[in-house]
């Protein structure tokens, strides 16, 4: 959106005559009609596609035109437009004689025209005026013109809308190209995010206004980088809130019980690692191939059925061994000793020797697959048609019958209002008969999913063991407040069990 401005400066008609050569009586009471239209290689008298404007009578015969209002008309003349400025134009300026007070076209005699000029060319948006002078046999017109953007419109074509604001929806001013320039202390695409105090912990701190650092539950300190341990924790520390991770040799809910069962009893067998986990309790971490509370039981590696093609598995000290049936070999009996001479290809498949006849490969006819062409292909099983298209088997080929609004071999192309991806923030676009509709992801709303809304992060019940869940509305995250006897960011660990052993 913008305005084409035309400033009439001086009109000279020394002899006071009309275009026909007839003199005006008593003088030429002159007013102007202006027609602005798209660029034409040959300017023609047709409709004024960009707009028209008329002046009142500005003077008689020869006169200068003031820069302000003259006889009720504005100078410069304003020709507003509400489209992208194309950068080119055609301009027609007509000077007319008004014998009376009625300036309507139908009220004037056809020979009341004094002069008519037409120009065309390129014109970029800008503040600078272009000065021009057009002379005919009897008249001369001096004028200047320019194109400027309307308020809140920017860019080379006045096509970018930007309105400065300093409220909940954004804190910014507009640059000359229409891009946003955040006010000090604000960031983000729409300058909605405050810039917190320098060094404020990214996850554990937040702010609702610039240079602030507010701590989330369980964190403390000027920069919210110190966790708050479990209340009453004695010989322990925390790495996440409400933890009480005991120092070496200490146990109990508050790390006030001495425990060192591993050192005194060495309960773990077969080279397992022992961890103290409470008063007179321990945990053994077994080496591969062992299981049991104390890692006393040996695992059989044949339990996973590693041998293929009917091979039988035998346990060995250093692993296992596969005994292959006739026709197969390899570590897992995965290789076939069959050749093309055994006619292994079904359904008309052609056999090709490989590795000097030691192996083979089947080339399957259309509609069959598998290493021996033993499987029939249903071309529709892979569901190749996108966007709800219906798959139709057509002999050796297939085709997709597309839903309205889609096209392409696999209905992969939109032919709809959704083609320009109008839904913000990952919203899903649905074509409707009279437009489109956006289905927004959690946390967003509005006709185009452009409005961010808060999510109840606790809605999915992320905390275990009857812990209390708190939602932080400014970041849409949760914090779990653990009951007595449990720790962890979700209160998932009984006290004393390290997080690396989730049983």
């Amino acid at each position: 959106s913008g305005v084409f401005q035309l400033q009439l400066q001086e009109f000279i008609n020394e002899r006071g005559v009309l275009a026909s050569g007839r003199p005006c009586e008593p003088g030429c009471r002159t007013f102007f009609r202006v027609c602005l239209k798209h660029f034409q290689a040959v300017v023609s008298p047709g409709p004024c596609t960009f707009g028209t404007v008329s002046t009142p009578v500005l003077g008689t015969n020869s006169f200068a035109v003031r820069d302000d209002s003259s006889g009720g008309g504005r100078n410069p003349l304003q020709l507003p437009f509400n489209f992208t400025w194309p950068g080119t134009f055609s301009l027609i300026i007509e000077a007319w004689h008004a014998p009376g007070d009625d300036l309507r076209p139908e009220a004037l005699p056809p020979d009341a025209l004094i002069s008519k000029i037409a120009i065309q060319g390129s014109l970029a948006v800008g503040q600078n005026w272009l000065l021009d002078e057009q002379t005919s046999t009897l008249t001369r017109l001096r004028y200047s013109y320019r194109v400027i953007c309307s308020d809140n419109y920017y860019g080379d074509n006045c096509s970018r809308l930007c309105k400065k604001r300093n409220d909940h929806f954004g804190h910014y001013v507009c640059q000359p190209d229409g891009n946003l320039s955040c006010l000090p202390g604000w960031t983000g695409e729409y300058c909605q995010q405050p810039i917190c105090l320098s060094g404020c912990h990214e996850q554990n701190g937040y702010c609702s206004k610039p240079a602030e650092c507010l701590c989330r539950p369980g964190w403390q300190g000027r920069l919210c980088n110190e966790c708050i341990p479990h209340n009453g924790c004695r010989h322990g520390t925390c790495s996440t809130p409400w933890q009480c991770t005991c120092d070496e040799g200490w146990g109990g809910l508050f790390c006030d019980q001495d425990l060192n069962y591993c050192t005194h009893h060495s309960p773990c067998k077969n080279g397992a690692t022992c961890s103290n986990s409470g008063q007179r309790s321990y945990t053994c971490t077994c080496r591969p191939g062992y299981t049991g509370v104390d890692c006393e039981l040996e695992l059989s590696e044949c339990d996973s059925n590693p041998c293929r093609n009917g091979g039988s598995c035998k346990d060995q000290e250093d692993g296992y061994h596969c005994l292959c049936p006739p026709g197969y070999y390899g570590l897992h009996c995965e290789h076939s000793t069959l050749s093309c001479a055994d006619s292994p290809c079904f359904n008309g498949g052609s056999c090709r020797e490989r590795n000097q006849g030691a192996n083979y490969a089947c080339e399957c006819p259309p509609n069959f697959t598998g290493s021996n062409c033993e499987k029939k292909v249903d071309r529709c099983t892979s569901n190749p048609c996108a966007n709800g298209g219906q798959c139709l088997n057509r002999g050796p080929s297939r085709m997709c019958r597309c839903r309205p609004g889609f096209t392409g071999t696999y209905c992969e192309l939109h032919v709809s209002d959704c083609a320009r991806n109008p839904c913000a923030h990952g919203g899903t676009c649905h074509d409707l008969e009279n437009g489109l509709m956006c289905t927004c992801p959690a946390g967003f709303s509005g006709r185009r999913c452009e409005v961010r809304t808060s999510i109840d992060a606790c809605a999915s019940s992320p905390c275990f063991n009857r812990a209390t869940c708190y939602t932080d509305l400014s970041t849409d995250t949760f914090v779990c407040n653990c009951p007595y006897g449990f720790v962890g960011s979700r209160c998932e660990f009984p006290v004393g069990l390290p997080p690396s052993f989730p049983w």
Epitope: H38, S44, G46, P47
Partner: antibody, heavy 121, light 111 residues
């Protein structure tokens, strides 16, 4: 080359509305041309009715302005003519046409084959 | 409205001869040094076809046998030499003043 195809009803009752569609192929109706409706009466007299410029600007024959409108659907590359309160005098062959607006405004270089509409009770 | 009067209403010309069709406007169709007069050919059962635009400019694909001239209110379409394929009705049209108008047509036949 630009191609145009008219479609619409063969028969309309007096006082009803006549709606015609022109489908344009091989040229976008939003690029550099103007798109017209012209009708030819049974005696072969031609009358220019209206046009829609590529920018969306519309222009009508003043004698029809009170009962005519021209619109477009850019997604389908179609433009439409709506003529209200028809009488038997409106029976004609209706043509849609296109002109290169920057080079020869008013000279219509591309024409459809025409569609005949009869107003009768 | 500008009224366009074509003459003659019908014309019979021998093959290879010159055909001249006249179009007179009720007022000038000149603007900015151009005459906004155009000529069309219409064969039976077909839409009109643009031959000449702005008085004398030959439309792309039209043979040079067709030419146009004139200014202000008097205009002429000339076909020289006439061929059998030229049998049609010829219309003039102005776009200088609203509404755009057509002439009544001249029917060309072969003698």
């Amino acid at each position: 080359d630009v191609q145009l195809q008219e479609s619409g009803p063969d028969l309309v009752k007096p006082s009803q509305s006549l709606s015609l569609t022109c489908t344009v192929t091989d040229h976008s109706i939003t690029s550099g041309y103007s798109w017209h409706w012209i009708r030819q009466f049974p005696g072969n007299k031609l009358e220019w009715m209206a046009y829609i410029h590529y920018s969306g600007y519309t222009h009508y024959n003043p004698s029809l302005k009170s009962r005519i409108s021209i619109t477009r659907d850019t997604s389908k590359n179609q433009f439409f003519l709506h003529l209200n309160s028809v009488t038997t005098e409106d029976s004609a062959t209706f043509y849609c046409a296109g002109s290169d607006y920057s080079a020869n405004e008013g000279a219509m270089a591309y024409w459809g084959q025409g569609t005949s509409a009869t107003v009768s009770s | 409205d500008i009224v366009l009067t074509q003459s003659p209403a019908s014309l019979a010309v021998s093959l290879g001869q010159r055909a001249t069709i006249s179009c007179r406007a009720s007022e000038s169709v000149d603007s900015f040094g151009n005459s906004f007069m155009h000529w069309y050919q219409q064969k039976a059962g077909q839409p009109p076809k643009l031959l000449i635009y702005r008085t004398s400019n030959l439309q792309s694909g039209i043979p040079a046998r067709f030419s146009g001239s004139g200014s202000r209110t008097d205009f002429t379409l000339t076909i020289n030499p006439v061929e059998a394929d030229d049998v049609a009705t010829y219309y003039c049209q102005q776009s200088n003043e609203d509404p755009w108008t057509f002439g009544g047509g001249t029917k060309l036949e072969i003698k």
